[in-house]
């Protein structure tokens, strides 16, 4: 039984892999930052997380997903205010009972740090120094991203 | 209430480089892009640039090569420098909050009052 | 660089009028993002219209946008004494940002 969380994160991931290819996005649009090899897109308005991971959608990208603690902390760096927290792309998984990511994959328990409970209805959130385990009904700003990439790709749920 | 000044020299003599300061009063600088427009007398709206909080930068091609925008986090204060003026640059520079793509609203929300700036010897 | 071209230049209106401001792009303009603008001699820009459509905090319910790719419109429903100013819209889907050349709406 999938939570309605879950769906509304398959349904988005479904409806984003229907294009089969894409031009490479060789440089950052406006308003996006370089960090890497991926394009940021940080909010300054709050919503939940399933309208996080919709609002990325429809701008052709997907919260955050963030590969290792060194991506993290890259990221963190960006994050000038201590207090601001963030949706990225994770969220607890009721029937595997395991944080998965929304491109489909588990987490690695060596990547993220988590304060907080692993529960029905938690998603994740970083701010500047941490990150947390937070209701997905919170109202927070989340981070969206584009892959950078200099060729033709196909388009995978994680790009 | 978020505000925004202007604050500079309203007199810049050909060749040299013209100054502007804009003061963010009553918010954070944070997560918005803080932009700098022009208008020459009885004309349009040209925009110069942004400044993103992280010190990340876009200027608009015509005036990149004399455009440097810069921000001080501490001060809540982003700068205006272009350089090499002539008569041609001599406008009403506006500093403006723009709430990018992301946000209850987009676009230049909040704008300075503006300052004339005349270039002549 | 997306060139935004205003039509008509001047708009001679009364009061109680409706106003339609014509706004095309050489290219279309990403996910509608499109502002209109406001100004009055002497002053700033105020902002009225963001995402093609969508009224800025404050702005009476007179005022409306709509329009997507290349195509947008500003509309005046009524005209108040208030309304005769310059108006200009702007994308900000594309680098560089860019204006139209404006529409002035006076009183005929």
């Known amino acids: 039984q999938k939570s309605s969380i879950e769906k509304c994160s398959v349904d988005i991931q479904q409806s984003r892999n229907k294009t089969t290819e894409r031009p490479g996005l060789l440089n950052c649009p406006i308003y996006w930052q370089q960090l890497r090899e991926k394009c940021l897109l940080f909010s300054h308005t709050v919503n939940p997380w399933n309208n996080s991971l919709a609002d990325c959608s429809t701008k052709e990208s997907s919260l955050l997903l963030i590969r290792d603690k060194d991506e993290l902390i890259h990221t963190q760096n960006l994050i000038r205010d201590k207090a601001i927290l963030f949706w990225i792309g994770l969220n607890f998984s009721l029937s595997e009972k395991n944080w998965k990511w929304i491109n489909g994959s588990f987490l690695n328990s060596n990547d993220l740090e988590i304060r907080g409970d692993a529960k029905e209805n938690s998603c994740i959130s970083i701010s500047q120094t941490s990150v947390y385990s937070e209701y997905c009904s919170t109202e927070i700003r989340w981070i969206c991203q584009k892959e950078l990439t200099p060729v033709r790709n196909k388009v995978y749920p994680d790009s | 209430q978020v505000q925004l000044q202007e604050s500079g020299p309203g007199l810049v003599k050909p060749s040299e480089t013209l100054s502007l300061s804009c003061t963010v009063s009553g918010g954070s600088i944070s997560f918005y892009y803080w932009t700098w427009i022009r208008q020459p007398p009885g004309k349009g709206l040209e925009w110069i640039g942004y400044i993103y909080h992280s010190g990340s930068t876009n200027y608009n091609p015509s005036l990149k090569s004399r455009v440097t925008i810069s921000v001080d986090t501490s001060k809540n204060q982003f700068s205006l420098k272009l350089s090499s003026v002539t008569a041609a640059d001599t406008a009403v520079y506006y500093c403006?909050?723009?709430?990018?793509?992301?946000?209850?609203?987009?676009?230049?929300?909040?704008w300075g009052q503006g300052t004339m700036v005349t270039v002549s010897s | 660089e997306i060139v935004l071209t205003q039509s008509p230049g001047t708009l001679s209106l009364s009061p109680g009028e409706r106003a339609t401001l014509s706004c095309r792009a050489s290219?279309?303009?990403?996910?509608?993002?499109l502002a209109w603008y406001q100004q009055k001699p002497g002053q700033a820009p105020r902002l009225l219209i963001y995402g093609a459509s969508s009224r800025a905090t404050g702005i009476p319910d007179r005022f409306s946008g709509s329009g997507s790719g290349t195509d947008f419109t500003l509309t005046i429903s009524r005209l108040e004494p208030e309304d005769f100013a310059v108006y200009y819209c702007?994308?900000?889907?594309?680098?560089?940002?860019?204006f139209g050349g404006g529409t002035k709406v006076e009183i005929k």
């Open positions: 702007q994308q900000y889907g594309s680098s560089p940002l860019t």
């Open positions: 403006a909050r723009d709430g990018g793509i992301v946000g209850a609203t987009n676009a230049f929300d909040i």
């Open positions: 290219q279309s303009v990403t996910s509608s993002y």
